[in-house]
């Protein structure tokens, strides 16, 4: 790292090291030989999250309900607001600036991982012995019915989209 002229939490201005403003405060005026750096707290709905020399605080993020967003964590003077999505929706990016509806798993696919506010549904194909006959964001693949345990026989084989069809055993005459 290149050498710096000042201590940590200081900045160089007019050949002099001035104190940075602490998180939650903005710079009003630089220090002089006789005066300290002047800082002011950020206003309502504003924040600064680092030691800084910013003359304006940042606005808290707005969680727009029209985009399916809601407040997960209210911002403070030192932290931004954290948005998440309404139930049934998830963020389109890490910054969570908008939401999309959770994906449903088509027939033949089951839910491997249920969606959260920040991640979409993860689907997986139903393996042999399992099926899903609905389009759902919650349903896993279900195992085929075991005809044998019901003292029945398979009359129609199952697929990844349909259950087996059981029927009575043929009686020997």
């Amino acid at each position: 790292e290149p050498p710096t002229a000042c201590r940590e939490k200081q900045y160089l201005i007019n050949s002099q090291c001035c104190s940075l403003c602490q998180p939650g405060q903005k710079l009003v005026s630089d220090c002089t030989e006789f005066t300290e750096t002047e800082c002011l707290p950020c206003g309502e709905s504003e924040f600064l999250d680092t030691w800084n020399r910013e003359t304006h605080c940042h606005q808290h993020k707005y969680c727009d309900p029209n985009l399916g967003l809601r407040v997960q964590q209210k911002g403070t003077s030192e932290t931004d607001t954290i948005c998440t999505c309404e139930e049934g929706w998830h963020c389109t990016s890490e910054a969570c600036e908008s939401c999309v509806l959770h994906r449903s798993c088509s027939p033949g696919f089951g839910v491997k991982q249920i969606a959260t506010g920040v991640s979409d549904t993860i689907c997986e194909p139903c393996p042999v012995g399992f099926f899903s006959n609905v389009s759902s964001a919650f349903e896993k693949c279900h195992p085929w019915t075991s005809c044998e345990t019901k003292d029945l026989v398979v009359q129609q084989a199952g697929t990844n989209k349909t259950d087996v069809v059981c029927g009575p055993q043929d009686r020997l005459r």
């Epitope: 790292e1 710096t4 201590r7 940590e8 050949s15 002099q16 090291c17 104190s19 750096t37």
Partner: antibody
Framework: QVQLVQSGAEVKKPGASVKVSCKAS????????MHWVRQAPGQGLEWMGW????????NYAQKFQGRVTMTRDTSIPTAYMELNRLRSDDTAVYYC???????????????????WGQGTLVTVSS | DIQMTQSPSSVSASVGDRVTITCRAS??????LAWYQQKPGKAPNLLIY???TLQSGVPSRFSGSGSGTDFTLTISSLQPEDFATYYC?????????FGGGTKVEIK
């Protein structure tokens, strides 16, 4: 009372490395920057850099950039200065020195040294 | 880097004399200046900081003045224990820099 106790004298060959330690006692080690200053025989004082024992942050003089490493171990309040690729003109007494705690320092870096180690003589000779 | 120039490089004086050492910075450093005393084989000892503030335990015969680029260390009445080398140091910005030193010798 505040004390800075340094490791003993070292004799090194050109191209080698040396690591000098400085054990602090009598104050909160993480609360004050530690600086390293050297003095060649019969010469003046030369500032090498500082370490903030709290964050581990460092700042080295341009002259020593890439050759010096300052570290600390807060569990045994000790600061270290390692100098690599030693040359004969690195022969000097190396001092650790503590920042004067100036409560009202509002501008300037205000690094004055109120406590010094006893010094460690490093001799570089083939 | 800020250059610190001390003068004289040496001075011969007698006990009881008034001794003045000057230090000039290559650019303005406000009042961010310290003075140290160093005796042979010993670490430096802080005498004055912020140009004129006497460090705790330092005799009042030592005083400092100046701001900007020109600074002075004065020993009002030299004592036997004051024969030593004196250094100024700027504390305005890094890298910290020292003057070349002034050796106060017995006349």
């Amino acid at each position: 009372q505040v004390q800075l106790v340094q490791s003993g004298a070292e004799v090194k060959k050109p191209g080698a490395s040396v690591k000098v330690s400085c054990k602090a006692s009598g104050y909160t080690f993480t609360g004050k920057y530690m600086h390293w200053v050297r003095q060649a025989p019969g010469q003046g004082l030369e500032w090498m850099g500082w370490i903030n024992p709290d964050s581990g942050g460092t700042n080295y003089a341009q002259k020593f950039q890439g050759r010096v490493t300052m570290t600390r171990d807060t569990s045994i309040p000790t600061a270290y200065m390692e100098l690599n690729r030693l040359r004969s003109d690195d022969t000097a007494v190396y001092y650790c020195a503590r920042d004067q705690p100036l409560g009202y320092c509002t501008n300037g870096v205000c690094s004055y040294f109120d406590y010094w180690g006893q010094g460690t003589l490093v001799t570089v000779s083939s | 880097d800020i250059q610190m120039t001390q003068s004289p490089s040496s001075v011969s004086a007698s006990v009881g004399d008034r001794v003045t050492i000057t230090c000039r910075a290559s650019q303005g450093i406000y009042s961010w200046l310290a003075w140290y005393q160093q005796k042979p084989g010993k670490a430096p000892n802080l005498l004055i900081y912020t140009a004129s503030t006497l460090q705790s335990g330092v005799p009042s015969r030592f005083s400092g003045s100046g701001s900007g680029t020109d600074f002075t260390l004065t020993i009002s009445s030299l004592q036997p224990e004051d024969f030593a080398t004196y250094y100024c140091q700027q504390a305005n910005i890094f890298p910290l820099t020292f003057g070349g030193g002034t050796k106060v010798e017995i006349k």
